[in-house]
């Protein structure tokens, strides 16, 4: 049940992480102009990832995409490729995590299987997160070491007539969209992580039990596959001791692929 | 059609208070920044105050800041320009302006006289 | 404050000549977000509030006959009639648009020789 929870958790988590990276990668709100401590312009200036705006006191805004690809800052199309990253993980992870869900039957599929996709999709979110937050703090600095630029000459001119006030930009909404969707879709991940672990068949493994009946005999392989005699039902992962039934290298355990989570 | 009608001018003594309204038709006037501009006697125009597009952010001259107040009611469609502590020199034609393209003044009224004298 | 310079203050014409109206502004009124710049012209008749001509410097207002043109940025600007007409005699003012508080220059009369 707790991990019913734990793994439904984690996807809803995710699931709105990844909604916000998408939202703050199609926000045109990265960068705003500075107000404080600045002359009062009658029009407010913001930029995306995708295109820059101009809003008016007279309520009109004016918005112009990135037509070029090759004159844009490097920078830029870094983030822009961290956020893209980001979303197509973020998607993946989503649509491999619906499948993992404990509550959603498809198929016979088996709770290894379950486990592994879960690990799969909590990796996925995890790296989906950390590309945006890593995108988003990319830019940000980029627009700390812009502002002190421009602070620094800010008012430039000739023949000490101010000529041009310099626009400043600080961080825009779309930075904090930024970092606590990425943040979410990291917890997110780690959550789905956490559940993967109580999927995974913790209990010993077992090569063979060999169980000799009068009438015939039964094998049972570890796993639990359901065996004819109509009781096989409820030897799944468990130790068979029952008369006769001998089991072998009782103590001996082997490593499963989610012992290091 | 556009159309801007002010009214609420008139003779007031100095130190005295004058509402000026702006009747708003044609257009959601919410929507639109929106400002009072007057012409002085010298046939000087100054910029009284703007309120802004789809916001209710104000902006006055240094001035007149504390003295004139803009604001709109978007049930009536009506803009006011509410003077106080009024002085000679703020007698003028005061229009009411809708803001267009570049912040520039597109539609003006036909102006409503306020004389500030004693 | 942004001081709007207009010259001339007065200009006689003759019907048909070429009219250049000069405004200068003591601050860039160009917006680098969208690259363009914040001055307006207007065009006042005796009796009658301003009417708009040119906005953002060099942009027609829908109307406005094309012997008017705006031209200039960052901090000098120009508006030309190519062939004054009898109906253009008015007093014509530019306007800064950028900067609160919003400005005008003081006027250029446009009149018959």
């Known amino acids: 049940m707790a991990v019913t929870a734990c793994q439904g958790l984690g996807f809803v988590v995710s699931l709105i992480g990844i909604a916000g990276i998408i939202a703050a990668t199609c926000m045109d709100q990265w960068s705003t102009q500075d107000l404080y401590n600045n002359p009062v312009t009658a029009v407010f200036n913001y930029q995306g990832l995708w295109r820059s705006c101009v809003r008016e006191s007279s309520g009109f805004t004016e918005c112009r995409g990135y037509f070029t690809l090759l004159g844009l800052p490097a920078m830029l199309q870094a983030v822009r490729a961290l956020m893209i990253v980001g979303i197509v993980l973020g998607a993946i992870g989503l649509l491999v995590s619906i499948f993992a869900l404990k509550c959603i039957r498809i198929g016979s599929m088996e709770d290894s299987a379950k486990a592994n996709m879960t690990l799969t999709s909590g990796i996925m979110f995890i790296v989906s997160g950390l590309c945006a937050i890593a995108g988003v703090s990319v830019f940000a600095n980029m627009l700390v070491t812009n502002f002190w630029m421009s602070t620094a000459n800010m008012y430039t001119g000739m023949g000490g007539m101010v000529q041009t006030v310099q626009t400043r930009y600080t961080f825009g909404a779309a930075l904090f969209v930024g970092w606590v969707a990425g943040g979410l879709t990291l917890i997110g991940g780690v959550m789905m992580c956490i559940a993967c672990r109580g999927l995974a068949p913790e209990e010993t493994n077992y090569k063979a039990v060999s169980y000799h009946a009068s009438g015939h005999s039964v094998a049972y392989k570890p796993g639990g596959f359901k065996a004819s005699t109509g009781f096989g039902s409820n030897t799944k992962n468990k130790k068979i001791y029952d008369g006769g039934a001998r089991t072998e290298d009782e103590v001996q355990s082997y490593p499963s692929k989610h012992d290091y989570v | 059609e556009v159309q801007l009608v002010e009214s609420g001018g008139g003779l007031v003594k100095p130190g005295g208070s004058l509402k000026l309204s702006c009747a708003v038709s044609?257009?959601?006037?919410?929507?639109?920044?929106m400002s009072w501009v007057r012409q002085t006697p010298e046939k000087r125009l100054e910029w009284v105050a703007t309120i802004i597009g789809g916001g209710s952010s104000t902006y006055y001259p240094d001035s007149l800041k504390g003295r004139f107040t803009i604001s709109r009611d978007n049930a009536k469609n009506n803009l006011y320009l509410q003077m106080s502590s009024l002085r000679s020199e703020d007698t003028a034609l005061y229009y009411c302006?809708?803001?267009?393209?570049?912040?520039?003044?597109?539609?003006w009224g036909q102006g409503t006289l306020v004389t500030v004298s004693a | 404050d942004i001081v709007m310079t207009q010259s001339p203050s007065s200009l006689t014409v003759t019907a048909g000549e070429k009219v250049t109206v000069s405004c200068k502004s003591s601050?860039?009124?160009?917006?680098?977000?969208?690259?363009?710049?914040?001055l307006t012209w207007y065009q006042q008749k005796p009796g009658q509030p301003p009417k708009l001509l040119i906005y953002w410097a060099s942009t027609r207002e829908s109307g406005v006959p094309d012997r008017f043109t705006g031209s200039g940025s960052g901090t000098d600007f120009t508006l030309t009639i190519s062939s004054v007409q009898a109906e253009d005699l008015a007093v014509y003012y530019c306007q800064n648009n950028y900067f609160y508080p919003l400005t005008f220059g003081a006027g250029t009369k446009l009149e018959l020789k």
């Open positions: 302006v809708r803001l267009y393209f570049g912040n520039s003044f597109a539609y």
């Open positions: 044609g257009f959601t006037i919410n929507n639109y920044g």
């Open positions: 601050q860039s009124l160009s917006n680098s977000g969208n690259q363009r710049n914040y």
